[in-house]
């Protein structure tokens, strides 16, 4: 997260990391008992390691009585997902077994109406990427708290020049964006999931190259259908 | 404290513009949006738009786009906003407010400015 | 646009009696929505945020309840102080529209 500042330990008991032989990977937002919402291409590189969810975490390093680690029961991204295009970058993973809820470890609920945020609404996105552009990794959690931009300025030629689809959102990046790391993890608008971070390797902080998430409403059936 | 002080009351002529303050202090500025919301005589309030200092960054109420104006100054802490072609419908008390933050995304108008009350008349 | 529509516009109260304010939104707004208090004069001041937690320093007689569209604040045992004028403002989009306002008056 660039521009943003460090989160209220645990106040936001649906973040999720993503890890890779046990370091962080990729942002992951909690959805369901046992099931974690992620970014498709976190797990592009991941064939041969071993892929682990943490829950209950503020800190990556420091022992906390909340944080425990679970083993991935199954990966499923979504089936039209592809390493070149930041389309359809959604993944669920289902933990080894269910979460032991408590107040640092909630599912958080997510939007189904398929309609579009109304630009100007500020949106708080959170993870444990890089804080600036030498590549510093934060230990604890940051947040920032974000305009949504509306798709026909996002989709200006100066900016995504039309990549922005229907399924995707955009929020403001001036000097405070998402970025590497923070792939996967959730856009919360008023207290509801509207946006996972999409994980592509687009530059941070350029207010010419806005945050694009992934819109989740547009994906319920995809989601229903795998947790059912 | 927070606190959060207007410029004085203004009366201006119709056609003109008008500047208006907002002095932030008992808080890091940069951190939190500044809101500006209007109030006509015995009426409701209606939001007119946010600034965020740490960016400047803004975003209208699509009634107030053309009519309103909004800056800051990060040196002093200050809010400003700019009035333009003033008429009696713009006669109003107009309050700055912050937003405070609640958890991990909702939010609220926490702090406000005493209100600075402009007048339009010839 | 969200329209927000407050009730009753006016009411005249007794010290002591407890009154209830409602809000309706034109659509869902998850529980994005705020109370304030307005006395003639003065600006508001925030009472009740995401629908049900009340702000710092706010006394326990106020209370905020409802989801979805519906959405009211409560005042158990009036005093003297809390008449004036009452404000609802959602924030689940823009504009974040107010209601109309609720002016409690003294019986």
């Known amino acids: 997260i660039l521009g943003g500042r460090e989160a209220e330990a645990h106040a936001r008991p649906y973040m999720a990391s993503v890890q890779l032989n046990g370091a962080h990977l990729c942002g992951g937002v909690l959805v369901a008992e046992q099931w974690v919402l992620s970014a498709a291409h976190c797990l592009e590189d991941a064939a041969d390691g071993k892929v682990q969810v943490l829950l209950g975490a503020h800190s990556l390093s420091q022992p906390e009585p909340s944080k425990r680690l679970y083993d991935v029961l199954r990966a499923v991204p979504h089936p039209d997902s592809q390493p070149d295009t930041i389309d359809h970058d959604l993944l669920l993973l289902q933990l080894s077994e269910k979460a032991t809820l408590g107040p640092a470890v909630r599912p958080l609920p997510w939007q189904r109406v398929d309609r579009d945020v109304a630009p100007g609404t500020l949106c708080d996105v959170a993870g444990w990427g890089i804080v600036n552009h030498a590549g510093r990794r934060p230990d604890s959690l940051q947040h920032v708290l974000l305009p949504v931009l509306d798709r026909a300025t996002c989709n200006r030629r100066t900016h995504h020049d039309g990549a922005i689809t229907e399924r995707l959102m955009c929020a403001e990046s001036n000097r405070r964006d998402s970025c590497k790391g923070d792939s996967g993890g959730p856009l919360v608008c008023g207290g509801v999931l509207e946006g996972v971070v999409t994980s592509g390797s687009r530059v941070c902080g350029n207010r010419k190259k806005p945050g694009i998430y992934t819109r989740v409403a547009s994906y319920a059936a995809w989601i229903d259908s795998v947790l059912a | 404290q927070v606190h959060l002080q207007q410029s004085g009351p203004e009366l201006v002529k119709p056609g003109a513009s008008v500047k208006i303050s907002c002095k932030a202090s008992?808080?890091?500025?940069?951190?939190?949006?500044i809101n500006w919301v209007k109030q006509r005589p015995g009426q409701g309030l209606e939001w007119i738009g946010w600034?965020?200092?740490?960016?400047?960054?803004?975003y209208y109420n699509e009634k107030f786009k053309g009519k309103a104006t909004l800056t800051v100054d990060k040196s002093s802490s200050t809010a400003y906003m700019l009035l333009s072609s003033l008429t009696s419908e713009d006669s109003a008390v107009y309050f700055c407010?912050?937003?405070?933050?609640?958890?991990?995304?909702?939010?609220?108008?926490?702090?406000w400015g005493q209100g600075t009350s402009v007048t339009v008349s010839s | 646009d969200i329209q927000m529509t407050q009730s009753p516009a006016s009411l005249s109260v007794s010290v002591g009696e407890t009154v209830t304010i409602t809000c309706r939104a034109s659509?869902?707004?998850?529980?994005?929505l705020a109370w304030y208090q307005q006395k003639q004069g003065k600006s508001p001041q925030l009472l009740v945020y995401?629908?049900?937690n009340l702000a710092d320093g706010v006394p326990s007689r106020f209370s905020g309840s409802g989801s979805g569209t519906q959405y009211s604040l409560k005042i158990n045992s009036l005093q003297s102080e809390d008449f004036g004028s009452y404000y609802c403002?959602?924030?689940?989009?823009?504009?974040?529209?107010f209601g109309g306002g609720s002016k409690l008056e003294i019986k």
């Open positions: 407010a912050r937003y405070g933050y609640y958890g991990s995304s909702f939010y609220a108008m926490d702090y």
């Open positions: 008992g808080y890091t500025f940069i951190d939190y949006y």
């Open positions: 600034i965020f200092p740490g960016s400047d960054s803004t």
């Open positions: 659509e869902n707004i998850y529980s994005n």
């Open positions: 995401a629908a049900t």
């Open positions: 403002q959602h924030f689940w989009g823009t504009p974040p529209t």
